[in-house]
């Protein structure tokens, strides 16, 4: 038998909150559990769904979840079925609504001394408790001639008088929560002695020096007073006009006339009506001076034939808002057709070449008129005047490739070299007519070139192959001065290129032949073991049939690398004494010695009286000062190599000898003393 271990039970629930109806069964076989609501099966949704055997509610809904729920367990094999006890929700809720007029039937029927009933359409369960408000202030029972039942949703005013006028709102609360009226009711009960608006002044826009009229009328019993004020609360009357309102006239019917309006007259005017009773009624209107700004410039436009294009005219800022229209050849454009005006836009449908020309946008208001022209060009596809042709260009000379085309507007020409866009630099120049100039043609310029001539209407292109007629040249040119280390192997390369592969040979500049230990192998001069007799001038000669021969002269120096015979040592010297930094170097060619102190080269011609560099390279500094301290670098260099060595110089104060020290006591440092 199927047994319910847990059965659903009726319970309180809150609108929009979670809830759970529990159901647990025990049975010998496999059972299938489902739920019924008022006898109909419950379908799972995101809001309400089965969770195990229980029914879970993500958000209780007072409309969809009202009724009786029942848990049903069924054994599909035996057909046995068991049903739980019924369960339902006591759903607590509250929902806002408007304040509405219940009696009389319409607002038009509200008269002084009649009964007025307002109803608060806030509903809820349990039944809410209501509170009424006038102009935000709570109303209590029996207050000022009105009967209020806070248990009820009705507010009765009997009888209703002008003092009951105001904005009525209500709030209600119950166990679920609180809500206030979604729409409030304004009760307006006229008092004959209150000033009432008959004709309100309207904002006015006038051109400078024109006239402006404000109308204003109130009614009341007895008739009300009417007064005009301007901006700074200055009263305007026919007897006392403020200085800046000399041309103001107030008529008997309340209208205000301003003549020959100036900018200082612009501003807010107030018309005030005061009845025998009640508050003053203040009406405002603004006098604006008409104005119109300049229009922004149009960029020239280029369109293609057959397309549809639009040009928007941004109206200038102005008061009142300017009206806008387009003209072409002095004629206003229609609002339909192939070329027409739509709103502020100029529309050109299926553009023809004949549509090219100047179109004018006009804007006008009370303050005046503005206009702005736009130049419209109808683009055409370029046509050839001269295509680029396959060319032979000489290396080292300028070369030209032509790409001459014509179109409207003037076409732009770009060149590609091996499919790569050519950007103008010191070697490539594209002239205004599209011709490409290659300055100083190089061998690798021999490739495909393509020019593309374009307008917005389309483009044409053509390509040409460039063949470079290579000049006879050394690649690279041999260094004119080269050094070889004595008694070492050395090579001096020489290579050349030309239209035909050149032959290369070396010879001594004096014409003598190369000694047997020096070989010339395909342009590389090879010294197996450099002797001093190998020093001198050599010539590399490159030649071919069509281009003749070229020569490169090389002076070879036989060198012995620089060695320091004497290097400067770390030296400490008393202030005021003399410092000697020794440096001797030898090498072949004989090296020159330079000194660097404090990161600057010491120029022997600008050393001053305290410093001196001897012939042998040693540096002497007399009368040393603390600022002479630092690193000193001896640099030995010749035309073949350079070497340097450095040592620090420390300048110290001479210590005051203590009594215990004899005259022969050694100084506390390894010193140079003079």
């Amino acid at each position: 038998a199927i047994v319910f271990i847990k059965q659903p039970s009726s319970q309180d629930a809150l609108q929009g909150r979670r809830a759970l109806l529990r159901c647990e069964v025990e049975a010998p076989g496999l059972v299938h559990v489902y739920w019924l609501l008022d006898g109909a099966p419950v379908q799972d949704t995101e809001r309400r769904f089965t969770q195990g055997s229980s029914l879970s509610f993500a958000a209780v809904d007072r409309l969809q979840d009202s009724g009786t729920f029942q848990c049903v367990a069924r054994d599909d094999v035996t057909g046995e079925e068991a049903r739980s006890a019924n369960a339902s929700f006591n759903i607590k809720w509250i929902e806002a609504g408007p304040v509405v007029l219940k009696h009389p039937a319409s607002e038009a029927e509200i008269q002084p001394q009649t009964q007025v009933t307002l109803r608060c359409h806030i509903d809820g369960h349990p039944r809410p408790t209501y509170q009424w408000f006038r102009d935000g202030t709570p109303l209590s029972d029996g207050q000022s001639n009105n009967t209020v039942s806070s248990k009820e949703r009705n507010l009765t005013l009997r009888p209703a008088g002008p003092e009951h006028s105001g904005l009525y709102s209500c709030c209600a609360h119950n166990a679920f929560g609180q809500a206030c009226s979604s729409q409030n009711f304004t009760l307006s009960i006229a008092d004959e002695s209150f000033a009432r608006v008959v004709l309100a002044p309207q904002d006015v826009i006038v051109a400078r020096n024109e006239e402006a009229m404000f109308h204003c009328q109130f009614s009341a019993q007895p008739p009300p007073n009417l007064q005009w004020l301007f901006e700074d609360e200055t009263p305007i009357t026919n007897r006392s006009r403020p200085p800046h309102l000399r041309r103001a006239t107030v008529f008997a019917n309340g209208s205000l006339l301003l003549t020959q309006v100036r900018p200082r007259n612009a501003g807010v005017y107030r018309c005030i009506g005061q009845g025998q009773r009640g508050p003053p009624v203040i009406l405002e209107a603004t006098l604006h001076l008409a104005e119109i700004e300049d229009m922004p410039l149009f960029e020239p436009r280029v369109f293609t034939a057959g397309s549809e294009e639009r040009v928007t005219c941004l109206p200038p800022k102005g008061l009142p808002e300017p009206s806008v229209w387009w003209e072409h050849a002095g004629v206003r454009l229609p609002t339909h057709g192939r070329v027409y005006q739509k709103g502020h836009e100029l529309v050109l449908a299926s553009i023809a070449e004949s549509d090219a020309g100047v179109y004018t946008c006009h804007a006008a208001n009370l303050a005046g008129q503005r206009r702005q022209d736009v130049n419209i060009t109808v683009a055409t596809v370029p046509t050839w005047l001269k295509k680029p042709q396959d060319s032979q260009l000489e290396e080292g000379k300028p070369g030209y490739l032509h790409c001459l085309t014509q179109a409207t507007p003037k076409p732009t020409v770009v060149w590609y070299r091996n499919q790569m866009l050519i950007s103008e630099d010191s070697r490539f120049e594209v002239f205004k007519n599209g011709t490409l100039r290659i300055n100083n043609v190089e061998v690798y310029d021999g490739t495909w070139y393509r020019c593309v001539s374009s307008t917005p209407a389309g483009s044409i292109e053509a390509q040409a192959r460039v063949q470079v007629l290579e000049k006879l040249k050394f690649t690279p040119p041999p260094q004119p001065q080269q050094c070889m280390e004595f008694d070492k192997e050395a090579t001096v390369p020489c290579s050349a290129t030309g239209r035909e592969k050149p032959t290369i040979k070396w010879e001594r500049a004096d014409g003598s032949s190369l000694p047997e230990w020096v070989t010339d192998n395909a342009g590389t001069l090879h010294f197996a073991r450099v002797t001093r007799d190998d020093a001198g001038n050599y010539t590399c000669i490159a030649s071919n049939g069509p281009q003749g021969q070229i020569r490169a002269h090389v002076q070879l120096t036989v060198a012995v690398f620089i060695t320091f015979k004497v290097e400067p040592e770390r030296t400490t010297v008393y202030q005021g004494h003399t410092a000697l930094l020794q440096c001797e170097a030898q090498g072949d060619p004989k090296p020159l010695i330079q000194w660097k102190g404090k990161d600057r080269i010491l120029d022997p011609t600008k050393l001053g009286p305290r410093m001196h560099i001897f012939q042998n390279g040693s540096l002497v500094i007399h009368d040393v000062a603390p600022e002479d301290s630092g690193r000193y670098t001896c640099i030995a260099g010749n035309s073949c190599n350079i070497k340097h060595t450095e040592a620090p110089l420390y300048v110290v104060d001479k210590p005051v000898p203590e009594e215990s020290e004899g005259p022969g006591s050694p100084p506390p440092y390894k010193m140079i003393q003079t």
Partner: antibody, heavy 120, light 113 residues
Framework: QVQLVESGGGVVQPGRSLRLSCAAS????????MHWVRQAPGKGLEWVAV????????YYADSVKGRFIISRDNSRDTLYLQMNSLRAEDTAVYYC?????????????WGQGTLVTVSS | DIVMTQSPDSLAVSLGERATINCKSS????????????LAWYQQKPGQPPNLLIY???TRESGVPDRFSGSGSGTDFTLTISSLQAEDVAVYYC?????????FGGGTKVEIK
């Protein structure tokens, strides 16, 4: 002050080997070329071999080529001469000499020498 | 190889007198690039290693007395001791360092008469 001290000399039979060393001090050994020069008893001076400051080049007199090997260890400031297949005519005082620079073949400092006697 | 020939083989000179030693090279040792003669003179006293006296044919090594002087150019060179002193008794060698291998003269023995 520059000092060169040779060692490793002695009496050796023909065809045998001997290794001479020269310990250097008082200068930057790795900046100078180094040579071996020999002097047979009662005879003049004969240049034997050179090694450059960096050990990159080595040259020999024709009389010892293929038998003697010059080498140096700049980290130990030491020069070596490996003498193989010694002959009677190799008998001499062997001097280690410093080059005037890197490769001048001019000798500004000499060691006291070590005597090598090749005799059966 | 450049052959160096010294003369005389030996020389006896009175104390305070001038001694002159000659050296001849089989090839020019004057280097045109710097106009220097690649020739040196050494002094070897009995039981001692040689000692550099003069290089560039005429430049005295530091510490060498000025009574020693060198001269000559190209292939012919001379070492002169202007006033012989007792400590100058030695064998004197010339050497070329113009080309490899470096070669020495046979030596000149200087004695006191």
């Amino acid at each position: 002050q520059v000092q060169l001290v040779e060692s490793g000399g002695g009496v050796v039979q023909p065809g045998r080997s001997l290794r001479l060393s020269c310990a250097a001090s008082g200068f930057t050994f790795s900046s100078y070329g180094m040579h071996w020069v020999r002097q047979a008893p009662g005879k003049g001076l004969e240049w034997v071999a050179v090694i450059w400051y960096d050990g990159g080049n080595k040259y020999y007199a024709d009389s010892v080529k293929g038998r003697f090997i010059i080498s140096r260890d700049n980290s130990r400031d030491t020069l070596y001469l490996q003498m193989n297949s010694l002959r009677a005519e190799d008998t001499a005082v062997y001097y280690c000499a410093r080059d005037w620079g890197s490769s001048w073949y001019l000798f500004d400092h000499w060691g006291q020498g070590t005597l090598v006697t090749v005799s059966s | 190889d450049i052959v160096m020939t010294q003369s005389p083989d030996s020389l006896a000179v009175s104390l305070g007198e001038r001694a002159t030693i000659n050296c001849k090279s089989s090839q020019n040792v004057l280097y045109s690039s710097n106009n220097e003669n690649y020739l040196a003179w050494y002094q070897q006293k009995p039981g001692q290693p040689p000692n550099l006296l003069i290089y560039w044919a005429s430049t005295r090594e530091s510490g060498v007395p000025d009574r020693f002087s060198g001269s000559g150019s190209g292939t012919d060179f001379t070492l002169t001791i202007s006033s012989l002193q007792a400590e100058d008794v030695a064998v004197y060698y010339c050497q070329q360092y113009y080309s490899t291998p470096p070669t020495f003269g046979g030596g000149t023995k200087v004695e006191i008469k």
